[in-house]
């Protein structure tokens, strides 16, 4: 019997996720695969030989290889999930625990600038805990959370790239910024 620590798993709000059982191969010896959501100690899906597959609701799908799909992730899907696998003799051959954490995907960052005081802002409106990275002509300038403000002093024309990322997504915007010599918006 193998009991391991939780597998840290990240899913995106509103999207599907597959909880794949690592190092598990389905075979004729397997009689029972049971998935539980541990917060309410409730069985959510179960495969049993010669019986119809059980699923607590339609957002769950259990594949033949034991993988659990959760459709259209919601915030209350964030939980600890446990899968227990038994052979035909009733022996618990595998147990895995998944710590499912959910984040909202980041939106595409918005780059805006003013030529008057050569200030550029990159901002991301949506997403859980986004980190922003700003680049000028390929060189990394700075990183921040949610908003970056940068005052540039060198060339009046440059290509800026801003990347927003969190554990479930990543989005980038590129803007060629060009300002007249005298600096007008």
């Amino acid at each position: 019997k193998e009991i391991t620590n939780a597998l840290e798993t990240w899913g995106a709000l509103g999207q599907d996720i597959n909880l794949d059982i690592p190092s598990f191969q389905m075979s004729d010896d397997i009689d029972d695969i049971k998935w539980e959501k541990t917060s309410d100690k409730k069985k959510i899906a179960q495969f049993r030989k010669e019986k119809e597959t059980f699923k607590e609701k339609d957002t769950y799908k259990l594949f033949k290889n034991g993988t659990l799909k959760i459709k259209h992730l919601k915030t209350d899907d964030q939980d600890i999930y446990k899968v227990s696998i038994y052979d035909t003799k009733g022996k618990n051959v595998l147990e895995k625990i998944f710590d499912l954490k959910i984040q909202e995907r980041v939106s595409k960052p918005k780059i805006s600038w003013t030529c008057i005081n050569t200030t550029l802002t990159c901002e991301v409106m949506n997403g859980t805990d986004p980190e922003l990275n700003l680049y000028q002509d390929g060189k990394h300038l700075k990183l921040s959370q949610r908003v970056i403000t940068h005052k540039w002093t060198t060339s009046l024309s440059a290509k800026f790239k801003c990347t927003a990322g969190n554990k479930v997504s990543k989005e980038s915007s590129v803007e060629p910024v060009s300002c007249p010599e005298k600096g007008l918006d």
Partner: antibody, heavy 120, light 107 residues
């Protein structure tokens, strides 16, 4: 249960190259950058660069731009770093570490390191 | 590149002591400063992130403070297992850079 597995040692000839591996398990591979850090015997830590398994974006320390190339194999959850044209000062322990994409500069977990010895 | 300077280079302590390790950045890095511990023949491990944020599994005797360019790692009652080298790291801009380390040893 997060694990970053690295081979223990690599013995290489001067002028040749070596490809170091780092196999990740216990977490969502595409949610974290994989960083590479060099440590020469009884010396400090030197950041070489990093790669994002989500889209293979890379950042390098300029000092290693012509020396190191990072790649990813998402099918096996493995990161690689190729070091080329090796000289004796490349003899060091090379660590891989992971950093979360939403707070990407803290190196949260580390592999055991691969000792690279450059010798003829 | 941002240069990180740590002091002292070596610190000799007695178990139970409260100790402070200093780290200075060559320019302001806000709170983008991370601390690592490396014991002999082991990999480094993250102790404190963003100057003062604690890490799950790290004993509460470790704490961090500071912002801008001056930072401190404190151990409020040193245990024998705390022996090792402590590194601070700039997490503000690339390349990520580390201090040369402070070696903590038992007197």
């Amino acid at each position: 249960q997060v694990q970053l597995q690295q081979p223990g040692t690599e013995l290489v000839r001067p002028g040749s190259s070596v490809k170091l591996s780092c196999k990740a398990s216990g977490y969502t591979f595409t949610s974290y950058w994989v960083n590479w850090v060099k440590q020469r015997p009884d010396q400090g830590l030197e950041w070489i660069g990093r790669i994002d398994p989500y889209d293979s974006e890379t950042h390098y320390n300029q000092k290693f731009t012509d020396k190191a190339i990072s790649t990813i194999d998402t099918s096996s959850n493995t990161a690689y770093m190729q070091l080329s044209t090796l000289t004796s000062d490349a003899s060091a322990v090379y660590y891989c570490s992971r950093s979360p994409r939403d707070s990407s500069t803290n190196l949260a977990d580390w592999g055991q390191g691969t000792l690279v010895t450059v010798s003829s | 590149d941002i240069v990180m300077t740590q002091s002292p280079a070596t610190l000799s302590v007695t178990p139970g002591d409260r100790v402070s390790l200093s780290c200075r950045a060559s320019q302001s890095i806000s709170d983008y400063l991370h601390w690592y511990q490396q014991k002999s023949h082991e990999s480094p491990r993250l102790l404190i992130k963003y100057a003062s944020q604690s890490i799950s599994g790290i004993p509460s005797r470790f704490s961090g403070s500071g912002s801008g360019s001056d930072f401190t790692l404190s151990i409020n009652s040193v245990e024998p297992e705390d022996v090792g080298v402590y590194y601070c790291q700039n997490g503000h801009s690339f390349p990520l850079t580390f201090g040369a380390g402070t070696k903590l040893e038992l007197r």
